[in-house]
Amino acid sequence: MAVTACQGLGFVVSLIGIAGIIAATCMDQWSTQDLYNNPVTAVFNYQGLWRSCVRESSGFTECRGYFTLLGLPAMLQAVRALMIVGIVLGAIGLLVSIFALKCIRIGSMEDSAKANMTLTSGIMFIVSGLCAIAGVSVFANMLVTNFWMSTANMYTGMGGMVQTVQTRYTFGAALFVGWVAGGLTLIGGVMMCIACRGLAPEETNYKAVSYHASGHSVAYKPGGFKASTGFGSNTKNKKIYDGGARTEDEVQSYPSKHDYV
C-alpha cells in the first residue's frame, strides 16, 4: 500500500512539476525591468525565451518574437535547449510512469516490469528536473551579470548634458516557477525511485531451489536445501522467491534491487 502511495504521489508531484516546467518555458517574464532605484517609466519591459514584450501604461502590450537563431546569445540558446530537454524527458517519463503505476493493470504485466518502468521514469524525472533547474539557474546567472554591468554605467553621459535611461533587468516570475517546478519534478523522480525498490521483490529465505538436470525438465528440491552439486555441465543453482516455484526464465525476469546502481 505504501509503495502504491509513494508511486502515485511521485507521479502526481512529477506531473505538476513538468506542467510547471512547460509553463515556465512558455512564459514571457523570464526577466523583467528593474523598477527599483530607476526613473519611473511609462513602459514596462519584460523578456522570455522566445520573445520580448513591452507593456505601456496605456494598457497596450506589444510582443516581438526572436526571429533569429544565429543572432541570439549562446547562453539563451543553451537555456532553451535545457528546458526543452527537460520537457521531453519529463513527458516521456510521464508516459512510462503511467504504465508503471501499480494501480493500473495492463494485460499480464509483471511487477518486475513495473519496477523497471518505475525506475526508468524516476530517473527521467530526476534528469528533467535537473535540466530545468540548470536552465533557470544559467539564465539567472546571466541576469545577475548583466544587472551589475548595466548598474556600472546606469546613466551614460551624452555630451555631458543628455542622459540615457539604461534599462536593467531582474528576475521574472518564470524563474521562480522554473525553480519550483524543477524541484517538484526532481522530488517526484526520487519518490518514483523509492517506489521502485518496494515494487521489486526482495531477496528472502529460499523455500526451494530449482536446477536443470541436463536435458530434462526442471527439478524442485523442497525444504530450503541449496544444491551444491550438479548433474551436468549446464546445471545452475537458482534462487526461488517466496511467491512460489517458477521456471528459470520467469525467475530471471525479476530485477533485483542490485540491478540498478
Epitope: T41, A42, V43, E56, S58, G59, V162, T167
Partner: antibody, heavy 117, light 113 residues
Framework: QVQLQESGPGLVKPSQTLSLTCTVS????????ISWVRQPAGKGLEWLGE???????NYNSALKSRVSISKDNSKSQVFLKLSSVTAADTARYYC???????????WGQGTLVTVSS | DIVMTQSPDSLTVSLGERATINCKSS????????????LTWYQQKPGQPPKLLIY???TRESGVPDRFTGSGSGTDFTLTISSLQAEDVAVYYC?????????FGPGTKLEIK
C-alpha cells in the same frame, strides 16, 4: 463613437478642493487608461496624472501631494480631485484616452475652472 | 523631470511651403525594449482640445494627412509639414511619453506668411 466629457464647478474658492468628473462613452474604462491634462489660458499643456485600466495611478510629482484620480468603471466615470487650490490652478482641464505610445488619441472639450474668492 | 524644449517658438511659412518644428528632450526617449521613441506630437487649434498627430515619434495617427511626418530618435525630434495648408495654422506640442511625469514642450505657433 468615442466621447469624453468633463464636468464640474466652474468656480472654486482658494484652499478648497477642485472636483471634476470625466464621463466616457464608446469604450470601457477596463480597456483604456485615462489621463488628465490642464492648460492655463494662453499657456502650454501640463500633465496632471493618469489612471490605468486596473485602477493604478501616477501623478505629476509637482502636484503629487494635492492631486488624486479615481474611477468608477460601472458608471464610466473618472474623477479628478485637486486640494488646496490657488489662483495658479485656474485653467482649462482636459481628460484624454491613452492609446498606443501612451499618446492621447481622444480628448474631451475641456472644462474651465477659475479659482477665485 | 524631463525638460522638453521646442524651436522655434513661432514659425511663419507660406502656403505650400515646408514647415519644420524641432523638439529636444533632456533625456533619451528611446525604449531599449522595443527600440521605439516615446514622443508624441499634438496639434491644437484655437478654442479646441489638442489633436493627436504622431506617436512613437514617427507613426502617423489614422486620419492624419500624410503631409505630416515625424522623425528623430533619442533626444532630437522633428515634425515636418511638407506642404503647408491653411488649416494647419495651430500650436504644435511635443510630449515625452516615456518617463514620468509625462511633460509637454512649450509649443510652437505656426502661422501663414
Amino acid at each position: 463613437q468615442v466621447q469624453l466629457q468633463e464636468s464640474g464647478p466652474g468656480l472654486v474658492k482658494p484652499s478648497q478642493t477642485l472636483s471634476l468628473t470625466c464621463t466616457v462613452s464608446g469604450f470601457s474604462l477596463t480597456s483604456y487608461a485615462i489621463s488628465w491634462v490642464r492648460q492655463p489660458a494662453g499657456k502650454g499643456l501640463e500633465w496632471l496624472g493618469e489612471i490605468w485600466t486596473g485602477g493604478g495611478t501616477n501623478y505629476n510629482s509637482a502636484l503629487k501631494s494635492r492631486v488624486s484620480i479615481s474611477k468608477d468603471n460601472s458608471k464610466s466615470q473618472v474623477f479628478l480631485k485637486l486640494s488646496s487650490v490657488t489662483a495658479a490652478d485656474t485653467a482649462r482641464y482636459y481628460c484624454g484616452r491613452l492609446s498606443y505610445g501612451n499618446s492621447l488619441d481622444y480628448w474631451g472639450q475641456g472644462t474651465l475652472v477659475t479659482v477665485s474668492s | 523631470d524631463i525638460v522638453m524644449t521646442q524651436s522655434p517658438d513661432s514659425l511663419t511659412v507660406s502656403l505650400g511651403e515646408r514647415a519644420t518644428i524641432n523638439c529636444k528632450s533632456s533625456q533619451s526617449l528611446l525604449n531599449s525594449g522595443n527600440q521605439k521613441n516615446y514622443l508624441t506630437w499634438y496639434q491644437q487649434k484655437p478654442g479646441q482640445p489638442p489633436k493627436l498627430l504622431i506617436y512613437w515619434a514617427s507613426t502617423r495617427e489614422s486620419g492624419v494627412p500624410d503631409r505630416f511626418t515625424g522623425s528623430g530618435s533619442g533626444t532630437d525630434f522633428t515634425l515636418t509639414i511638407s506642404s503647408l495648408q491653411a488649416e494647419d495654422v495651430a500650436v504644435y506640442y511635443c510630449q515625452n511619453n516615456f518617463i514620468y511625469p509625462l511633460t509637454f514642450g512649450p509649443g510652437t505657433k505656426l502661422e501663414i506668411k
